[in-house]
């Protein structure tokens, strides 16, 4: 009878030990299985979860615009006063709804190439007005012409055309015209076949971004989605030195197993450069734990504050010998037009940049850019890309419309907020397929280990107690 009990207790302890050992073994084995599955599923090739979402994003992406309506155009043109602006918006468009095209796998170098078609659909229900709303903004062609032709002879010619077309420093344009293009009356007088259509994003609809060539991750998962080349080149040819490099991914995803200590590098064709984000906080997105990576102020700093940025300072006059910060001259990427990119409302920009403009209210929460990355898969499940488009206008003695200016202005035209969040259905699916499975496996591991240890300890104590009792 005593033997039966003892044998039972030992058997229970052995089962507990086996469960505990199995739970313990399951931890690295399970992690290995998860890693293997993740590695298999994030590869960019036909049949994987990642590929399906990569070809056509399952997220609805909106681009909201706020236009800076100039309140005192005549005063600025006549007296070189501060420019008073009032932002109007949001005007919302649905973007990135088109699938990637010309997808070509290269098994030799483990890359996949594609183009991303551009398209924008106006969303009246998410906008404060219509595409026909009018705004007083800088005359893009008048401001750009003397910058492109810094030649006094040609400026005299251009002045004749500007006067003839009754153009001036500022103009009134509809939202649709300003964003997507209008026939400029001044440029229309140039007697040579030049493009006379002007718009902040012209041309956009029916154009493509790319060709992008990215690593598919088949041979090395730590390179998945990293851009190998853009438009057939590994460099941009816009910046000197390492600033010209195409680094990282396109920000839609990153190689899996993202750590908080990691700097996420990505390339954005909108700003004609590679940039980076650093870990900000852990957040819960529809029940999925994600890491929020934010663009640090350091990325927009002057070379004095961040020496790494020295090669993004390509001109010395407007930048006050590279001491100004928070604006990026992307003219080389825009056919020489004086386009400057910044954060909205000149967030993180030096006071000299925003001083000539009245009506700006920078706000970290509203105007910063962030990426919410699910750390196991590296997928960006939510993002907010915020940037401002500005045009430099300088005094030009030979152009009457600009001759009264006493200083250069970096004039804000508009700012945009491009956002995307994983849908509820997709989030549930993601939880079921990824985080749910990982959680379940973790729970099974802990349960086995816990139950096993408790059983082993309990049965061993009982066995020992029985033995001592019998010994007496």
């Amino acid at each position: 009878m005593g033997c039966d009990r003892n044998c039972g207790l030992i058997a229970g302890a052995v089962i507990g030990a086996v469960l505990a050992v199995f739970g313990g073994i399951l931890m690295p084995v399970g992690d290995m299985l998860i890693e293997k599955t993740i590695k298999r599923e994030v590869v960019l090739e036909e049949g994987t979860t990642a590929f399906k979402n990569w070809v056509k994003t399952g997220t609805t992406v909106y681009r909201q615009f706020w236009i800076f309506d100039v309140q005192n155009p005549d005063d600025v043109a006549k007296n070189s006063s501060k420019i008073k602006v009032k932002q109007r918006g949001p005007y919302t468009y649905r973007v990135r709804y088109l699938a990637k095209e010309n997808i070509t796998q290269d098994p030799e170098d483990h890359t996949v190439s594609f183009v991303q078609p551009n398209g924008a659909i106006f969303e009246p229900s998410l906008s404060v007005g219509t595409e026909d709303d009018n705004f007083t903004v800088l005359n893009l062609a008048v401001a750009a012409a003397p910058h492109i032709y810094q030649n006094s002879f040609v400026q005299v010619v251009l002045n004749s055309l500007i006067k003839k077309s009754k153009s001036s420093m500022f103009q009134t344009r509809s939202l649709k015209e300003l964003l997507w293009g209008y026939k400029d009356p001044f440029l229309s007088l140039v007697p040579y076949p030049i493009s006379t259509t002007v718009g902040v994003f012209y041309p956009y609809n029916d154009t493509v971004d790319g060709v992008y060539k990215v690593f598919n991750g088949k041979d090395n998962i730590s390179k998945v989605a990293i851009i190998e080349s853009y438009k057939g080149k590994r460099n941009l040819s816009y910046w000197p030195s390492y600033c010209d490099m195409i680094n990282g991914t396109d920000a839609a995803s990153f190689p899996p197993f993202v750590e908080k200590s990691r700097t996420l590098r990505f390339f954005s064709s909108d700003i004609c450069r590679s940039i980076y984000a650093v870990f900000g906080s852990e957040i819960d997105l529809k029940g999925i734990p994600v890491y929020r990576f934010v663009l640090p102020a350091n990325a927009f700093a002057s070379p004095l504050q961040n020496p790494d940025n020295h090669c993004f300072c390509t001109e010395k006059v407007i930048s006050n010998n590279c001491t100004s910060y928070g604006v990026l001259d992307i003219g080389k990427c825009k056919e020489g037009k004086p386009v400057y990119i910044s954060l909205p409302h000149f967030l993180h920009a030096s006071p000299d940049v925003s001083e000539p403009i009245e009506g700006l209210h920078p706000n970290e929460d509203e105007h910063r850019t962030y990426l919410d990355v699910e750390p196991i898969t590296g997928f960006t499940l939510q993002f907010a890309k915020r940037l401002q488009v500005n045009i430099l206008v300088k005094p030009a003695r030979k152009i009457e419309a600009l001759k009264n200016l006493k200083r250069p202005y970096i004039v804000p035209i508009l700012w945009l907020n491009e956002t995307g969040t994983i849908g509820d259905e997709k989030a549930e699916m993601f939880k079921t397929q990824v985080t749910g499975k990982i959680k379940l496996l973790g729970m099974v591991e802990m349960a086995l280990l816990g139950i096993g240890v408790v059983m082993f300890v309990a049965f061993m104590i009982s066995y020992c107690a029985c033995k001592s009792k019998n010994g007496k």
Epitope: N151, S152, F153, V156, S160, L161, L189, V190, P191
Partner: antibody, heavy 117, light 107 residues
Framework: EVQLVESGGGLVQPGGSLRLSCAAS????????IHWVRQAPGKGLEWVAW????????YYADSVKGRFTISADTSKNTAYLQMNSLRAEDTAVYYC??????????WGQGTLVTVSS | DIQMTQSPSSLSASVGDRVTITCRAS??????VAWYQQKPGKAPKLLIS???SLYSGVPSRFSGSGSGTDFTLTISSLQPEDFATYYC?????????FGQGTKVEIK
């Protein structure tokens, strides 16, 4: 086809006046602006005057300022160079030329102006 | 005014020779330089604008280079019809100014 044809040259006494014409075809002179360039016998080219597009400003070489006047009649698509107080050193072949960005892509055949007593 | 100094003022060359004419501006004119060819009794003809841009219909043996203050016109292989006088011109600032010319003669 773009063509420029000068006329009005000839022999004139010092202190005299002459009006040169430049008839254009194949393009609108007001869109481009017209220049006059001269070449003294055996010498190089010298820019003389310019009328900017759309009847814009007029510009002159220092050597002719106050004596020469450039004008255009858009209805006739013709440019003119009114030359007063002519001097011996104004003797030259006068060309009219089309330009927009400052280089001359089309030239007339030239008309000879001789200032001599 | 911007002075344009051409050199040499004349040169003798044979058919097939490579000929180089230089032009120096008295101040920076960026790439706003044009080159012309003129034959006796004729109007000048545009060869090159913006220092390097070959005008339509001009043979590819003509090429231009330079930026700032120093510019060059090169004829890679001289042809019989190339014997003429060549002028450079800056189209950066008014008054527009020409070089004094380079006469290319048969050796």
């Amino acid at each position: 086809e773009v063509q420029l044809v000068e006329s009005g040259g000839g022999l004139v006494q010092p202190g005299g006046s002459l009006r040169l014409s430049c008839a254009a075809s194949g393009f609108t002179i007001s869109s481009f602006g017209i220049h006059w360039v001269r070449q003294a016998p055996g010498k190089g080219l010298e820019w003389v005057a310019w009328i900017a597009p759309y009847g814009g400003e007029t510009y002159y070489a220092d050597s002719v300022k106050g004596r020469f006047t450039i004008s255009a009649d858009t209805s006739k698509n013709t440019a003119y160079l009114q030359m007063n107080s002519l001097r011996a050193e104004d003797t030259a072949v006068y060309y009219c030329a089309r330009s927009f960005f400052g280089y001359f892509d089309y030239w007339g055949q030239g008309t000879l102006v001789t200032v001599s007593s | 005014d911007i002075q344009m100094t051409q050199s040499p003022s004349s040169l003798s060359a044979s058919v097939g020779d490579r000929v180089t004419i230089t032009c120096r501006a008295s101040q920076d004119v960026s790439n706003w330089v044009a080159w012309y060819q003129q034959k006796p009794g004729k109007a000048p003809k545009l060869l090159i604008s913006y220092a390097t841009s070959l005008y339509s219909g001009v043979p590819s043996r003509f090429s231009g280079s330079g930026s700032g203050t120093d510019f060059t016109l090169t004829i890679s292989s001289l042809q019989p019809e190339d014997f003429a006088t060549y002028y450079c011109q800056q189209h950066s600032n008014a008054p527009l100014t020409f070089g004094q010319g380079t006469k290319v003669e048969i050796k």
